[in-house]
Interface confidence: medium
């Protein structure tokens, strides 16, 4: 598994999101139905505190394509 170090902010956060989500694209805040802490966005979750790639994945726009 990947091992996170510290926090992700700014260009570093966008870079990592782009890589994790690829051509799926991503949201900076997830739809309310996909998260229990409704007010939190990715900046709060990953820039204000450390996060992992599994959490970043939840901000990807659509599920991975099969083709």
């Amino acid at each position: 598994a990947y091992r996170p170090s510290e926090t992700l902010c700014g260009g570093e956060l966008v870079d990592t999101l782009q890589f994790v989500c690829g051509d799926r694209g991503f949201y900076f805040s997830r739809p309310a139905s996909r998260v229990s802490r409704r007010s939190r966005g990715i900046v709060e979750e990953c820039c204000f505190r450390s996060c992992d790639l599994a959490l970043l994945e939840t901000y990807c726009a659509t599920p991975a394509k099969s083709e």
Epitope: A1, Y2, R3, P4, S5, E6, L8, E12, D15, T16, F19, V20, G22, D23, L53, A54, E57, A64, K65, S66, E67
Partner: antibody
Framework: QVELVESGGGLVQPGGSLRLSCAAS????????MSWVRQAPGKGLELVSS????????YYADSVKGRFTISRDNSKNTLYLQMNSLRAEDTAVYYC??????????WGQGTLVTVSS | DIVLTQPPSVSGAPGQRVTISCSGS????????VSWYQQLPGTAPKLLIY???KRPSGVPDRFSGSKSGTSASLAITGLQSEDEADYYC???????????FGGGTKLTVLG
Amino acid sequence: QVELVESGGGLVQPGGSLRLSCAASGFTFTSYWMSWVRQAPGKGLELVSSITSYGSFTYYADSVKGRFTISRDNSKNTLYLQMNSLRAEDTAVYYCARNMYTHFDSWGQGTLVTVSS
Amino acid sequence: DIVLTQPPSVSGAPGQRVTISCSGSSSNIGSNSVSWYQQLPGTAPKLLIYDNSKRPSGVPDRFSGSKSGTSASLAITGLQSEDEADYYCQSRDTYGYYWVFGGGTKLTVLG
């Protein structure tokens, strides 16, 4: 054009250490994840370790976890692999590769690491 | 560990068409694209096909790739002696964020 040049390989005894370097040029280094891929003599390719653009996340194959450390110095456009507690089975050509989302689009020429007493 | 399965060797005569198969699972090929690399003797791997069927500039159109389900294949038409090399397929693990390779296939051009 993209160029990746590895160095630091050589002969080392079991239990010893080596530090590999990969000097990158011809592209914006900070825009890419980078990896080390190795190939044991007569064998196939094996992903050893990967690192995100700014070094925030690192991946290690189970076979090297706890012994190898990947890092990068974006100010020097250089990727590193610190290898400790080396074993005979670590003997391989180590390639530095540039990651795209789905593949490796550029490779270095490789540096040979031989672990033997 | 070798995650993707390839035949150890294939062969063909000059001018012929050969295919190399690559079998994976739903967590790699089934949900990600496949790439192929050519490794000539004594050299570093070279990207041959990416995103299942795209060729980087400079790669002849004799090389083509395809994917169906959890398997992929590389086809080489008009086989030439300089095509003799090792060929590796590669994909990505969907939620592990790492890349997986096949064991490699040695292509021998006969005659």
